[in-house]
Interface confidence: low
């Protein structure tokens, strides 16, 4: 998921214009803002800041419970809240503190949580 | 979530080394491979390919159901499966087909799905 293929035809060093083009013109940034709270596998968002990275701020999801919220609003431990993870690309200053030289870096972030049936091991 | 802050202290054009450094050394890429099927809000993954973009292949999640899977294995339409979305950074060839000149682009991708309580509108 996410950038999980290494493109072999790309050159090693390239020029990149950091003036971001945002393709998300039709999206309402608040439309999923409360999923973290309404989910049966709710999560909290934690700020991860690193001035040597672009973007410098990334939000990490941490599931609130081991189990999932049932219809009564209680935690059901027969189900599991698990993080949905995605590899994303970021730019890392290289060498450190460099103003205009970066290296592409792949990092794994937790985007949110989902409720799954646990893997049951049957004993003979 | 994801790269959602614009860093004002960055220069406009930079050099980027595309030899990716992967920080996910301790992660098993398949460890969450079956969440899409075990989730109460299961999803399918769809390939989005664009040779003008780096990475050229991105995976998009599409929730299988409007509702969520209940304990009986049936779809419960009193709950909603919704996509968890994240903004990610990609490189877009600029001008088109350029071999070594890119522009940073922000796109919204659906990473997976979560089950949420629907918004209920109460009629007076």
């Amino acid at each position: 998921m996410g950038p999980n293929s290494e493109d072999k035809n790309f050159p090693r060093t390239v020029m990149v214009n950091l003036n971001i083009h945002n393709r998300n013109t039709n999206t309402n940034p608040k439309r999923s803002s409360d999923y973290y709270d309404r989910s049966t596998s709710p999560w909290n968002l934690h700020r991860n800041e690193d001035p040597e990275r672009y973007p410098s701020v990334i939000w990490e999801a941490k599931c609130r419970h081991l189990g999932c919220i049932n219809a009564d609003g209680n935690v059901d431990y027969h189900m599991n809240s698990v993080p949905i993870q995605q590899e994303i690309l970021v730019l890392r200053r290289e060498p450190p503190h460099s103003p205009n030289s970066f290296r592409l870096e792949k990092i794994l972030v937790s985007v949110g949580c989902t409720c799954v049936t646990p893997i049951v091991h049957h004993v003979a | 979530m994801g790269p959602n802050s614009e860093d004002k202290n960055f220069p406009r054009t930079v050099m980027v080394n595309l030899n990716i450094h992967n920080r996910n050394t301790n992660t098993n890429p398949k460890r969450s491979s079956d969440y899409y099927d075990r989730s109460t809000s299961p999803w399918n993954l769809h390939r989005n390919e664009d040779p003008e973009r780096y990475p050229s292949v991105i995976w998009e999640a599409k929730c299988r159901h409007l509702g969520c899977i209940n304990a009986d294995g049936n779809v419960d339409y009193h709950m909603n499966s919704v996509p968890i979305q994240q903004e990610i950074l990609v490189l877009r060839r600029e001008p088109p087909h350029s071999p070594n000149s890119f522009r940073l682009e922000k796109i919204l991708v659906s990473v997976g799905c979560t089950c949420v309580t629907p918004i209920v509108h109460h009629v007076a």
């Epitope: - | 491979s33 899409y36 099927d37 399918n44 292949v57 159901h65």
Partner: antibody
């Protein structure tokens, strides 16, 4: 041009295990859904199951207790195992590539490349 | 499971005829339907996805329509190579399910 080549035992006795392998030539293994379908003599097509690009499997519930689909990405191959076969499992078995295609903001699915088919007879 | 019912199960036609095959789903599948052609002893061939989009290389005499539960495959001006069995396949949900097939034979 992508081609699928399949092989495996064509004659089995009841209670034995059917084992078929499908190799992908001339195209990427990553990024598609790899399916098995069967067709009893003179009858229609029945979907058995699929394995996706991250190793997740989904099976037809009618066969789920007996079927296993696995992959060997290093060889660009995927396999089908069907346990405890009976005469009702006599059929031509096909492997096929599942692909998702976008139209607007929606995705559609199709089995665009098929193996040559392997006739399997179960007889005592 | 979503049951896909095709009709007719067989039909006889002549070269140049306009042929219509229908496929009915047991529940709403939006436009998540494809069509496949299979000739005797041959592998199925992918014709149409998403109800009406032709797969690359498929002649324009083939067309699809419908939405929800009722779908149609139409062959305008039937050609000799079109005599075959046609199957619909729903991809709205798992398990994927095929219609039982419609055999188009010579009149």
């Amino acid at each position: 041009q992508v081609q699928l080549q399949q092989w495996g035992a064509g004659l089995l006795k009841p209670s034995e295990t059917l084992s078929l392998t499908c190799a992908v030539f001339g195209g990427s293994f990553d990024g598609y859904y790899w399916n098995w379908i069967r067709q009893p003599p003179g009858k229609g097509l029945e979907w058995i199951g699929e394995i996706n690009h991250i190793g997740g499997t989904i099976y037809n519930p009618s066969l789920k207790s007996r079927v296993t689909i696995s992959e060997d990405t290093s060889k660009n191959q995927f396999s089908l195992r069907l346990n405890s076969v009976t005469a009702a499992d006599t059929a031509t078995y096909y492997c096929a590539r599942g692909i998702t295609m976008g139209r607007g903001n929606y995705y559609y699915y199709g089995l665009d490349v098929w193996g040559q088919g392997t006739p399997v007879t179960v007889s005592s | 499971d979503i049951l896909m019912t095709q009709s007719p199960s067989s039909l006889s036609a002549s070269v140049g005829d306009r042929v219509t095959i229908t496929c009915r789903a047991s529940q709403d599948i939006k436009n998540d339907l494809g069509w496949y052609q299979q000739k005797p002893g041959k592998v199925p061939k992918f014709l149409i996805f998403g109800t009406y989009s032709l797969q690359s290389g498929v002649p324009s005499r083939f067309s699809g329509s419908g939405s929800g539960t009722d779908f149609t495959l139409t062959i305008n001006s039937l050609q000799p190579e079109d005599f075959a069995t046609y199957y619909c396949l729903q991809d709205n949900n798992y398990p994927r399910t095929f219609g039982q097939g419609t055999k188009v034979g010579f009149k």
